[in-house]
């Protein structure tokens, strides 16, 4: 129960992107306004997007103090203009989100093949190590820096005249491969958390291919 | 409870086709990479080939290049084996197996297995 | 693609015996090798990945190790359930390749 013209949000979803993460939920607010706290499991409510007429709020900045925590958020429901008016109970209409654990559960962006190079018959591909927004000593670390032995790179390559992907995986970023003399290959990567049942892979990395820009062929 | 249940095998003629299921139970095969390793009777392993469901990319083993087609159904959690112009020594117990990784061929849980019969 | 040569092919042993099973890469596979158990009529089980880790709930009496490009699982004291066959795998690159088998049989 709240005020006859106030409604408690519903469908809370955590997204979340290399720890960039927003919840989100409805409805759209009809002459209501909407306040966000968030906490970790034995930590104090932290109040966010104070009496917003959004369906979102961006609480990155307090997950990234602790990947690893869990959070909760709640959304509560306001009568627009009279933010001090409470449901029956003496309190604000809310709803809680589901629990998110960042560390466990943010989804993997889609990587980038920053370069690769041929020497011979082998071929190093390097992909492009992300920042995100944790942030330690004032710095922001990369994916790798976050997840460490956690995360692996697939590689999946194939002659440009071929259709079959062939894979190779890396806990760096970098692939060492053997290719053969005088074809032409194509790569796409993607990045993948084993140790995780749910949000396991990224999507994949946009293909690039040998002979255009990013790449350097030398003989030997 | 991971499962991974194959089906559709049986006799068949030389030249003949099948299509063997793999239904998976307890994970999303999204998530995961599937492979199909077959075992001719009392012979070892034999790597068949894989499917990324995420990406749809397959690679198969030089001996069924061309023959064999590996696809995969997210909605029924399912992936499937053609098997077409079949040879007698495509005989075998074919398995479908979780990769523990990410596509590499390391496999954490293997189906029961589906015997697959190339006689006339 | 990448050999993998195993040895023995059979061998006998009695419970309580320490067996050594080893395999050996025709060319660097880091150590990207599982092994793995299959008893008749069975689809095979995961016993060691990566060359040296235990694969969840297998009895510690297993262990993998790795030296270059050979690679050993050690049973340090057979017991009547391991009576199986044993092959190894590399999946360092496209298509994984496994060894010929090695069946451990009572003596």
């Known amino acids: 129960s709240g005020t006859t013209n106030t409604v408690a949000a519903y469908n809370l979803t955590w997204k979340s992107t290399n720890f960039k993460t927003i919840l989100e939920w409805e409805p759209k607010p009809v002459n209501q306004v909407y306040t966000v706290q968030i906490s970790t499991k034995s930590g104090d409510w932290k109040s966010k997007c104070f009496y917003t007429t959004d369906t979102e709020c961006d609480l990155t900045d307090e997950i990234v103090k602790d990947v690893k925590q869990t959070y909760l958020a709640r959304v509560f429901s306001y009568p627009a203009g009279n933010v001090e008016s409470t449901g029956s109970a003496g309190e604000p209409l809310y709803e809680n989100s589901p629990e998110f654990t960042p560390y466990l559960e943010t989804n993997l962006g889609q990587p980038t093949i920053q370069s690769f190079e041929q020497v011979g018959t082998k071929v190093n591909v390097t992909v492009e190590d992300e920042r995100t927004l944790v942030r330690r000593n004032n710095t922001f670390l990369s994916l790798r820096d976050v997840f460490g032995k956690d995360l692996i790179y697939t590689l999946y390559y194939w002659k440009s005249s071929s259709s079959g992907k062939k894979t190779a995986k890396t806990n760096t970023n970098e692939f060492l491969i053997d290719v053969d003399k005088g074809e032409n290959y194509c790569f796409s990567v993607q990045a993948v958390i084993p140790s995780r049942t749910v949000n396991r892979k990224s999507t994949d990395s946009p293909v690039e291919c040998m002979g255009q820009e990013k790449g350097e062929f030398r003989e030997i | 409870e991971v499962q991974l249940v194959e089906s559709g095998g049986g006799l068949v003629q030389p030249g003949g086709s099948l299509r063997l299921s793999c239904a998976a139970s307890?994970?999303?095969?999204?998530?995961?990479?599937i492979h199909w390793v077959r075992q001719a009777p009392g012979k070892g392993l034999e790597w068949v080939g894989y499917?990324?469901?995420?990406?749809?990319?397959?690679f198969y083993a030089d001996s069924v290049k061309g023959r064999f087609t590996i696809s995969a159904d997210t909605s029924k959690n399912t992936a499937y084996l053609q098997v077409n112009s079949l040879r007698a020594e495509d005989t075998a117990v074919y398995y479908c197996?979780?990769?523990?990784?990410?596509?590499?061929?390391?496999?954490?849980?293997w189906g029961q297995g589906t015997l697959v019969t190339v006689s006339s | 693609d990448i050999q993998m040569t195993q040895s023995p092919s059979s061998l006998s042993a009695s419970v309580g015996d320490r067996v050594t099973i080893t395999c050996r890469a025709s060319?660097?596979?880091?150590?990207?090798v599982a092994w793995y158990q299959q008893k008749p009529g069975k689809a095979p089980k995961l016993l060691i990945y990566?060359?040296?880790f235990l694969y969840s709930g297998v009895p510690s009496r297993f262990s993998g190790s790795r030296s270059g490009t050979d690679f050993t699982l050690t049973i340090s004291s057979l017991q009547p359930e391991d009576f199986a066959t044993y092959y190894c795998?590399?999946?360092?690159?496209?298509?994984?390749?496994f060894g010929q088998g090695t069946k451990v049989e009572i003596k």
């Open positions: 197996a979780r990769d523990i990784q990410s596509v590499s061929g390391e496999f954490d849980y």
């Open positions: 307890g994970f999303t095969i999204f998530d995961y990479t």
């Open positions: 499917i990324d469901p995420s990406n749809g990319y397959t």
């Open positions: 060319q660097d596979v880091n150590t990207a």
């Open positions: 990566s060359a040296s």
């Open positions: 795998q590399q999946h360092y690159t496209t298509p994984p390749t």
